[in-house]
Interface confidence: low
Amino acid sequence: TPTTLASHSTKTDASSTHHSSVPPLTSSNHSTSPQLSTGVSFFFLSFHISNLQFNSSLEDPSTDYYQELQRDISEMFLQIYKQGGFLGLSNIKFRPGSVVVQLTLAFREGTINVHDVETQFNQYKTEAASRYNLTISDVSVSDVPFPFSAQSGAGVPG
């Protein structure tokens, strides 16, 4: 799947703060994702769309169902992370279980961390339900293990 690129790189809210401290529960929780030399952080995100049903059309990228859902999800992520160093998403996969969506997000290095990715996505769930008719649940975000595998297909420029 080709990467969907955002056409902006404004400063993220998450990088501008005068908080004295925001202690994570563990020392590693607030670290940024493992990075490539290109200055890009990658995050793996999965979630359920509970108001949709999985069928074989979601295994075939040429079908209308696949393309419409992929377009809506891509547009949704461009909206959610519009204010920051979001570079794009890739590797959208659909799995059974209502519809389970798995994808990879790319951000400019240092602009966001795994918890902020999850936070902003969770904040957007209600809006997504009305704007895209997607009822989102079971959100999970994790750092992409380093080294980032070449076959993952997230060819995002630095």
């Epitope: 400063k11 809210d13 998450a14 501008s16 204010q83």
Partner: antibody, heavy 118, light 111 residues
């Protein structure tokens, strides 16, 4: 230092529209989001909506059809428009700076009082 | 929408004593890392003032007699020792998801 100042019409006739401007200083709208909150006299706070640094907007679902939030980064101004005002929209309207990604609000304007009456 | 219920609605505390305000959410406002619950103080004729962010972090410039705790659905704001200038209405706010909501407020009077 950080400051926000709301300016509005004060009095709005029923069924008319409301426009409020929030002018900010001490920070850039390209770095921080701004929220709108209202408070009827003697009552609690109600979140209306938010515009993020990149321009993405979010609204209170109960008021979404009546609200529009926009901004002009170069003028350091955020705008709230609300359609079809009724008497229950009478309130103090505040703009507040989003502290950062956690969406607490660390600086507030003094508010502008809006009365809906004929 | 997540509903925040504050208790008590109003109460009075003697100078120097401890004031405790509760905020209960209709569903969890926490993730594995953070508790998305904030506390504000509002005095008559003034806008709200941020006291505590992320449940327990003291905002810069706020006296150390204010503290916050809790996770999941139950949160507490403590003021100790209470001073006269603490007479105000206190609100909790969540930002776990949209829409953000506020609690109904707790009015604190000083005896």
């Amino acid at each position: 230092q950080v400051q926000l100042k709301e300016s509005g019409p004060g009095l709005v006739a029923p069924s008319q529209n409301l426009s409020i401007t929030c002018t900010v200083s001490g920070f850039s709208l390209t770095d921080y989001g701004v929220n709108w909150v209202r408070q009827p006299s003697g009552k609690g706070l109600e979140w209306l909506g938010e515009i993020w640094a990149g321009g993405t907007t979010f609204y209170n679902s109960a008021l979404k059809s009546r609200l529009t939030i926009t901004k002009d980064n170069s003028k350091s101004q955020v705008f709230l428009e609300m359609n079809s005002l009724q008497s229950h929209d009478t309130a103090m309207y505040y703009c507040a700076k989003r502290l950062n990604w956690d969406s607490s609000m660390d600086y507030w304007g003094q508010g502008t009082s809006v009365t809906v009456s004929s | 929408d997540i509903v925040l219920t504050q208790s008590p609605a109003s109460f009075a505390v003697s100078l120097g004593q401890r004031a405790t305000i509760s905020c209960r959410a209709s569903e969890s406002v926490s993730t594995s890392a953070y508790n998305f619950l904030h506390w504000y103080q509002q005095k008559p004729g003034q806008p709200p003032k941020l006291l505590i962010y992320l449940a327990s972090n003291l905002e810069s410039g706020v006296p150390a007699r204010f503290s916050g705790s809790g996770s999941g659905t139950d949160f507490t704001l403590n003021i100790h020792p209470v001073e006269e200038e603490d007479a105000a209405t206190y609100y909790c706010q969540h930002s776990r998801e949209l829409p953000y909501t506020f609690g109904g407020g707790t009015k604190l009077e000083i005896k």
